[in-house]
Interface confidence: low
């Protein structure tokens, strides 16, 4: 064999005995008839030698080290060559070593061509025997970044201040290229950055520097993961140890592009994030260790990349092509205060553009899918405007306020479906007629259904909330003077099962002056609770509302008010209540700002309750709660 090393190539070749074997017959390197067991060849030297045995690979190994100095001159960046060529070397287990020294401010990047690298732990070996051992440097201390095989995900490793790369090739391996190149980068301000690229499903096991020994004190190491947007990544820690910190805390930080809470900080003992969509970074940060009893920080973890589970593979069609003035938003439910990372939860349009919230508008058919570990973290809010601009066209026209079935079939809970009902001012009013009579939500008789209708004025300057109403009561219809919003709000997933109970029809009717009229047809044996609009804030100034209460022929109604006085104090005008029998037109008038409220009274025929407010002084608002109870007549008084 002849090995000739060019002058100033900075290459040293060393042939030495490998691990001792139990072979009886020794083997030597023969050079100029001398028998030696170690041969060193330096730059500019040419050596001819042979071996004294037929299978030198069982006895010797060869190390080829090239020193690359980036301190004093330009760096030879680009694809790294195997020098001397493997064809010129004896067939021994060989290790090519590149030792690159650079300034602290210079970043060095090793770029691995396909196949990329797979990190292995202590005691593991590579199937083909080809290993890459990479180490860095902190001042004078060598830090092992890791040992890697082929056929993995690691595509780039960035370091600064220097890098030592050792490529070990078994004697029988035909490889004749290094498989990597070196590039210079700006300072990375940390020990190293390892880039791991997933092109499809798969997993990668990675380790902190020096594993299984301790990670260098107060250092920072980052892994960058490149994951296709349609796949999910989950991180799990296979093994870790914490050192004894004197200052700062050991932690991992996740950086997810587009997240509003970067970086997400975790303790190593925390459950690590899963179901992340797209690229992310993970960083391990050490601490200042106790000098007397430092302990060790080490971490071995796995990243699993797979297709999203369950709902994520399904495509849902939301057909809003026949809708007008409607928008549907799928968004995260509000969560309070937790700084813990939660896996990404995304909704995707056409399976391509994924974001944490998505708004669909009417006039089109939309295909959506979900990338989310727990769809209960999302909800839907829908707004639809029904407006009438021409009173001649709209009068007596009716619209059904129902949640379209396409929306009900989505795997995300509906939170609010709001209809904004707009009428021409002073021309038309509205009447709401439910499929099932409604109950008004009160503290005394709360709604316990899976949904309610929230009815409020939609006039910007008017703060008027009529109340919350749910199926299963006695309110037959609600008439309102002007623009309102009706919001179907769900309170439980069981709304899907109860959806058939929803159903409200709105009709445009001739204009009337009262703010609202409730038509109440009580059922026997149940107490109906009714309260004035804007319960918590008080009926707005100069507002009038009425209740039309039906009493069947064979029943008597007991009307009961729940406090002695209304509590209202008028600044201007008077607040009053009129109770009027519908058949005889006989009426009682009560001054609400002066009189006590009436004692329980009995009504044998249908009657009106009308409440009109004054302009109250602040803090002395008009809030009234009353009930109507039907009992059978004991004596026929007709």
């Amino acid at each position: 064999f002849e090995i000739a090393l060019p002058r100033e190539s900075n290459i040293t070749v060393l042939i030495k005995l490998g691990t001792p074997t139990l072979l009886a017959k020794p083997c030597y390197i023969v050079i100029s008839k001398r028998h030696i067991t170690m041969l060193s060849i330096k730059s500019g030297e040419r050596i001819v030698f042979t071996f004294s045995c037929q299978s030198p690979e069982n006895h010797f190994v060869i190390e080829i080290q090239k020193n690359i100095d980036c301190m004093s001159g330009p760096c030879p960046f680009g694809e790294v060559q195997l020098q001397p060529s493997t064809s010129l070397l004896p067939t021994l287990n060989r290790t090519f070593i590149w030792d690159v020294k650079a300034h602290k401010s210079i970043g060095l990047e090793l770029q691995f061509s396909i196949p990329r690298l797979r990190q292995i732990g202590p005691g593991e070996s590579c199937p083909d025997g080809v290993t890459h051992s990479i180490s860095g440097r902190i001042d004078a201390t060598v830090v092992r970044i890791g040992t890697f095989c082929s056929n993995g995900t690691v595509s780039r490793i960035k370091m600064q201040e220097g890098v030592k790369m050792a490529l070990h090739l078994p004697w029988f391996h035909p490889r004749n290229v290094s498989g990597f190149s070196i590039a210079n980068r700006s300072s990375i301000k940390r020990l190293c950055i390892i880039e791991s690229v997933f092109e499809g499903e798969g997993s990668a096991t990675l380790m902190s520097a020096n594993y299984p020994e301790g990670f260098p004190e107060d250092e920072l190491m980052t892994w960058q993961f490149v994951v296709p947007a349609h796949l999910r990544a989950s991180v799990s820690f296979l093994n870790f140890n914490l050192s004894n910190c004197e200052r700062k805390e050991e932690r991992v930080e996740y950086y997810i592009p587009g997240s509003t809470t970067n970086p997400e900080v975790f303790k190593l003992e925390d459950k690590q994030p899963g179901n992340m969509a797209g690229n992310f970074n993970l960083s391990l940060q050490g601490c200042d260790q106790d000098a007397q009893s430092p302990g060790i920080l080490r971490l071995q973890f796995q990243v699993l990349v797979q297709h999203p589970q369950n709902e994520s593979n399904k495509i849902y069609v939301v057909d809003l092509s026949n809708e007008r003035a409607m928008s549907l938003t799928i968004e995260p439910r509000p969560v309070k205060q937790s700084r813990k990372f939660v896996p990404g939860c995304f909704v995707c349009l056409e399976s391509r553009t994924c974001s944490s919230n998505l708004t669909l508008t009417s006039g089109s058919k939309h295909k959506i899918s979900f990338l989310c570990d727990d769809l209960t973290r999302l909800w839907m809010n829908v707004e639809k405007t029904i407006s009438c601009t021409d009173h001649r066209y709209c009068q007596r026209k009716s619209y059904s306020l129902q949640v379209p079935s396409d929306i009900l079939h989505l795997p995300v809970e509906l939170h609010d479906f709001s209809w904004k009902l707009l009428v021409p001012k002073d021309r038309l009013s509205l009447v709401l007629v439910p499929a099932q009579k409604l109950q008004q939500h009160t503290h005394e008789k709360p709604c316990n259904t899976s949904f309610s209708y929230l009815v409020a004025s939609a006039i910007p300057s008017q703060d008027l909330y009529f109340g919350s109403f749910c199926p299963g009561g006695s309110i037959k219809q609600i008439q309102v003077k002007q623009n309102i919003s009706v919001t179907l709000r769900t309170f439980a997933p069981s709304f899907q099962q109860e959806a058939s109970r929803q159903g409200l029809t709105v009709s445009f009717i001739p204009y009337f002056k009262e703010e609202g009229v409730f038509t109440v047809t009580p059922d026997t044996k149940s107490k109906v609770y009714l309260r004035t609009p804007n319960w918590d804030r008080g009926l707005p100034s100069l507002t009038s509302v009425s209740w039309n209460i039906s009493v069947p022929r064979d029943q008597v109604a007991c009307l009961t008010f729940f406090k002695e006085r209304s509590g209202v104090v008028c600044q201007t005008g008077r607040a009053f209540m009129i109770i009027q029998e519908q058949r005889t037109r006989a009426e009682e008038i009560f001054s609400l700002d002066e009189d006590v409220l009436p004692k329980p009274s009995f009504h044998h025929h249908s009657f009106w309750v009308n409440i009109s407010n004054c302009s109250p002084t602040s803090g002395k608002q008009l809030d009234l709660l009353f009930s109507v109870t039907l009992t059978p007549r004991t004596v026929d008084l007709t």
């Epitope: 301000k189 930080e253 509003t260 970067n262 309070k336 205060q337 937790s338």
Partner: antibody, heavy 119, light 107 residues
Framework: QVQLVQSGSELKKPGESVKVSCKAS????????MHWVRQAPGQGLEWMGW????????TYADDFKGRFVLSLDTSVSTAYLQISSLKSEDTAVYYC????????????WGQGTLVTVSS | EIVLTQSPATLSLSPGERATLSCRAS??????LHWYQQKPGQAPRLLIK???QSISGIPARFSGSGPGSDFTLTISSVEPEDFAVYYC?????????FGQGTKLEIK
Amino acid sequence: QVQLVQSGSELKKPGESVKVSCKASGYTLTDFSMHWVRQAPGQGLEWMGWINTETGAPTYADDFKGRFVLSLDTSVSTAYLQISSLKSEDTAVYYCSRGRDYDPHFDYWGQGTLVTVSS
Amino acid sequence: EIVLTQSPATLSLSPGERATLSCRASQSISDFLHWYQQKPGQAPRLLIKYASQSISGIPARFSGSGPGSDFTLTISSVEPEDFAVYYCQSAHSFPYTFGQGTKLEIK
């Protein structure tokens, strides 16, 4: 309206303890995190830590671990800062402030409590 | 931890002039930076959130720029009531840190 009202000034001797209160009104205490900030005489602002008002879990900056304790009494909508083994360098104005969102900006502040430690 | 460096330490201006206050972070902190104003004997007051978002009730002459690691608070035309100390605050990661402050004084 939202208000954070802190307890009055305190004069303490080294080695003693002090407990500063911060009463929240005009909003639900548990809907926002509560943070504490120190300002030594003539100096800048130092973030001390925060308390998760839903769980009561405190988090401290490194320089405020050990002698400083953040606590809460939701029944009276009040957050507390207790400092034990007082030192002269603890002389400062201590502010409580309400944290908004996950990456807090402090939209409401208490008026501050001056704690003076002198022998 | 994120170190915030404010400059200048003191800025002397006359009313009506434009004030430019700088805050530099030791690393990129996206837009997780807020600005506060503090007058003697008072608690700080939030001026700008998330680098450039305005706060209700704060005059429009206050504006901020970002994101990244270099941030600026600009007062387009300084009013007499604007003379105070201004602090930037990082909300990027624990611990939340403040800059050392810039004092805006009357020239």
